[in-house]
Interface confidence: low
Amino acid sequence: ADNFSLHDALSGSGNPNPQGWPGAWGNQPAGAGGYPGASYPGAYPGQAPPGAYPGQAPPGAYPGAPGAYPGAPAPGVYPGPPSGPGAYPSSGQPSATGAYPATGPYGAPAGPLIVPYNLPLPGGVVPRMLITILGTVKPNANRIALDFQRGNDVAFHFNPRFNENNRRVIVCNTKLDNNWGREERQSVFPFESGKPFKIQVLVEPDHFKVAVNDAHLLQYNHRVKKLNEISKLGISGDIDLTSASYTMI
């Protein structure tokens, strides 16, 4: 990484001290949680045509909506919507103004969390929304995946691979109409088997900005432009997941 943190990025964007931005990072305890060994379908060969990819979205057996995230200010705790059909606003019905007040974070209950895990994003994602995932990479890990989903589509697939042809690489992509698009690959790899991590994804008007362990890692231009339709984040892979939350900054 280039030691460029999201904090630095925001400092130059008219918000030098954004609300909800932690002052000291890396001190959160790493959680230990049971990982059921679920794997993501398919290996995503880098050079294969779209037909080689599995036609289904990432595993659907996510637990229901989480409860209130501990540590959030009492008035701002968001318990999450009910799970199941109709739980999310339909296309063309953006959430009400102020649906994401800057008082979060909202999200997962106290860890550890069961992986794969689903974090609902009831109003979709919006610029200046910060998603934070804390956890520990399992020993001998093979992969991690974050999937920002719009129905069956994956608007942003963030996929660190620990051993792709004996190399460590991060692959980002988008799945539309049941097919994967062009991969964007990043050889900077800040994850280590057995070690805790913090992933932060900041939604910007034109892209997602990703930082790992407080250092800027990459950005991914929006291919799905209707951000309000990106209504959940799937977290999967070889990790013990401590928490997953979001806040507005």
Epitope: P49, P50, G55, S90, S91, R150, G151, N152, T174, K175, L176, D177, N178, N179, W180, G181, R182, E184, N221, H222, R223, V224, K225, K226, E229
Partner: antibody, heavy 117, light 110 residues
């Protein structure tokens, strides 16, 4: 055999309505996003609408927005296009098309809609 | 939702190679979205010839190839044959979940 068969085309007066149907067979219909694409006589192809497998996401070209409605019945393996307030410029062959991110891989033979007084 | 730009016509002799260009913007062709190419003979439905910028569906001759650079995609047909005479259309997905077609290119075999 993967197949799409359109029906419902015909002659209609300006301002009138028509409902097109598309019967799908040979594949798991609900797994695929579907489209309507049209082609005016002697002109190029124009995408006009798409609908996701679950019907949750629906999109239209500006030229038909507010007048046309796409829908599907996965139990019947059928795609529909309800066309209201038809205009002369809507005269075209209408194709039912299966889509993927990479391309529209299965096309019906088309049904002709003629809007004329 | 403006159309992608293609030449109205191209021509070539049997055995030659031709290239048809398709120019869009960063919102479609250049925006990491995949370009597809279709062949249409008179009175027939379009047929997918190239998808995912450069992949051929099974059954399509390897004389057809696709590529993309920046905001421009290209279809190359080598070893032209009489049956290649047809209209060719490019298409791209856009970030707004719509699709956009090129205006079409008529290929004439001399």
């Amino acid at each position: 055999e993967v197949q799409l068969v359109e029906s419902g085309g015909g002659l209609v007066k300006p301002g009138g309505s028509l409902r097109l149907s598309c019967a799908a067979s040979g594949f798991t219909f609900s797994n695929y996003n579907m489209n309507w694409v049209r082609q005016a006589p002697g002109k190029g192809l124009e995408w006009i609408s798409s609908i996701y497998g679950s019907s949750r996401y629906i999109y239209y070209a500006d030229s038909v927005k507010g007048r046309f409605t796409i829908s599907r019945d996965n139990a019947k393996n059928s795609l529909y296009l309800q066309m209201n307030s038809l205009r002369a410029e809507d005269t075209a062959v209408y194709y039912c098309v299966r889509s993927s991110y990479g391309g529209m891989d299965v096309w019906g033979r088309g049904t002709l809609v003629t809007v004329s007084s | 939702q403006s159309a992608l730009t293609q030449p109205a016509s191209v021509s070539g002799s049997p055995g030659q190679s031709i290239t048809i260009s398709c120019t869009g913007t960063s919102s479609d062709v250049g925006g990491s979205y995949n370009v597809a190419w279709y062949q249409q003979h008179p009175g027939k439905a379009p047929k997918l010839m190239i998808y995912y910028d450069s992949y051929r569906p099974s059954g399509v001759s390897n004389r057809f190839s696709g590529s993309k650079s920046g905001n421009t995609a290209s279809l190359t047909i080598s070893g032209l044959q009489a049956e290649d005479e047809a209209d060719y259309y490019c298409s791209s997905y856009t970030g707004y979940s719509t699709r956009v077609f090129g205006g079409g290119t008529k290929l004439e075999i001399k």
